[in-house]
């Protein structure tokens, strides 16, 4: 049995330009200790979308549901979506260290943007 699962329940989300997109992610545990970060794309060129403690992400808001008893919610909402936001978003768990070590990624959620 896996010690930690990172779950992105939606394979894809479609949002009209100008609206907000909610990207859902849950982890089965806070252990191992370390942050969850959101990225768009994969590999060395991926774009950091949200980090709880570092950086400034004015369009991104955490929207977790703290009432979820059986897992931890790390969902985010991105406001004022534009066509440039299209892509696949990954919720990624890191193990705390110097530096933090990437441990596990969700399967990804593809965001598509419809015209207004």
């Amino acid at each position: 049995e896996e010690e930690l699962q990172v779950i992105q329940p939606e394979k894809s989300v479609s949002v009209a330009a100008g609206e907000s997109a909610t990207l859902n992610c849950t982890a089965t545990s806070l252990i191992p200790v370390g942050p969850i970060q959101w990225f768009r794309g994969v590999g060395p060129g991926r774009e950091l979308i949200y980090h709880q403690k570092e950086g400034h992400f004015p369009r991104v808001t955490p929207v977790s549901d703290p009432t979820k008893r059986n897992n931890m919610d790390f969902s985010i909402r991105i406001s004022n979506i534009t066509p440039a936001d299209a892509g696949t978003y990954y919720c990624v768990k890191f193990r705390k260290g110097s530096p933090d070590v990437e441990l596990k990624s969700g399967a990804g959620t593809e965001l598509s943007v419809r015209a207004k």
Partner: antibody, heavy 118, light 111 residues
């Protein structure tokens, strides 16, 4: 019904060792993060050690790091705390506690008393 | 380390009245919209029992006269109305960052 039953406490001299055990039942032990928390009249509740559900990751506060070792046997639904180089300040009631999400302590055992004294 | 300061250390409240316990963390315990602050009740000779998880969520089986509120560094546990079986010591606990830490406890008695 969830049950956590600690054992192994007792009186030990400073510098000595003890091994505490916690027998779990009534829940899927292998899915839970498990911890030990101790309680003293003077210091209140103090987190002592935590182990991930599969046993890969362990965490300790500086007060016990290098002296205490936490392990688990999921096949036996059991948790173990090996305590070496014991000091008078380790005297406490030791509770075994479960954490489904590695956050709040869901369930606690009744505790086992460790006394370190010459 | 995150230091948890509970107040008052003891509290005497009349039956049927409101009891309010405060807990202040030395730094924010919030992350991703969760407040990693929890409350426990401990009666003499018993282990602690989870009452409230993540600041405001009532644990299953806990009476709804218990409630929790707060965010970032300031949190409150309220018992309203206080009943005789609520006489106990109450502890706050943060799991936002290691080492996990507890408040010093608040002893609730009947006036």
């Amino acid at each position: 019904e969830v049950q956590l039953v600690e054992s192994g406490g007792g009186l030990v001299k400073p510098g000595g060792s003890l091994r505490l055990s916690c027998a779990a039942s009534g829940f899927t032990f292998s899915s839970y993060v498990m911890s030990w928390v101790r309680q003293t009249p003077g210091k209140g509740l103090e987190w002592v050690a935590t182990i991930s559900s599969g046993g890969t990751y362990t965490y300790y506060p500086e007060s016990v790091k290098g002296r205490f070792t936490l392990s688990r046997d999921n096949a036996k639904n059991s948790l173990y705390l090996q305590m070496n180089s014991l000091r008078a300040e380790d005297t406490a009631v030791y509770y075994c506690a479960s954490q489904l999400t590695g956050s709040e302590f869901d369930y606690w055992g009744q505790g086992t008393t460790v006394t370190v004294s010459s | 380390d995150i230091v948890m300061t509970q107040s008052p250390a003891s509290l005497a409240v009349s039956l049927g009245e409101r009891a309010t316990i405060s807990c202040r963390a030395s730094e924010s315990v919030d992350s991703y919209g969760n407040s990693f602050m929890h409350w426990y009740q401990q009666k003499p000779g018993q282990p602690p029992k989870l009452l409230i998880y993540r600041a405001s969520n009532l644990e299953s089986g806990v009476p709804d006269r218990f409630s929790g509120s707060g965010s970032r560094t300031d949190f409150t546990l309220t018992i309203n109305p206080l009943q005789a079986e609520d006489v106990a010591t109450y502890y706050c606990h943060q799991s936002a960052d290691l080492p996990w830490t507890f408040g010093g406890g608040t002893k609730v008695e009947i006036k």
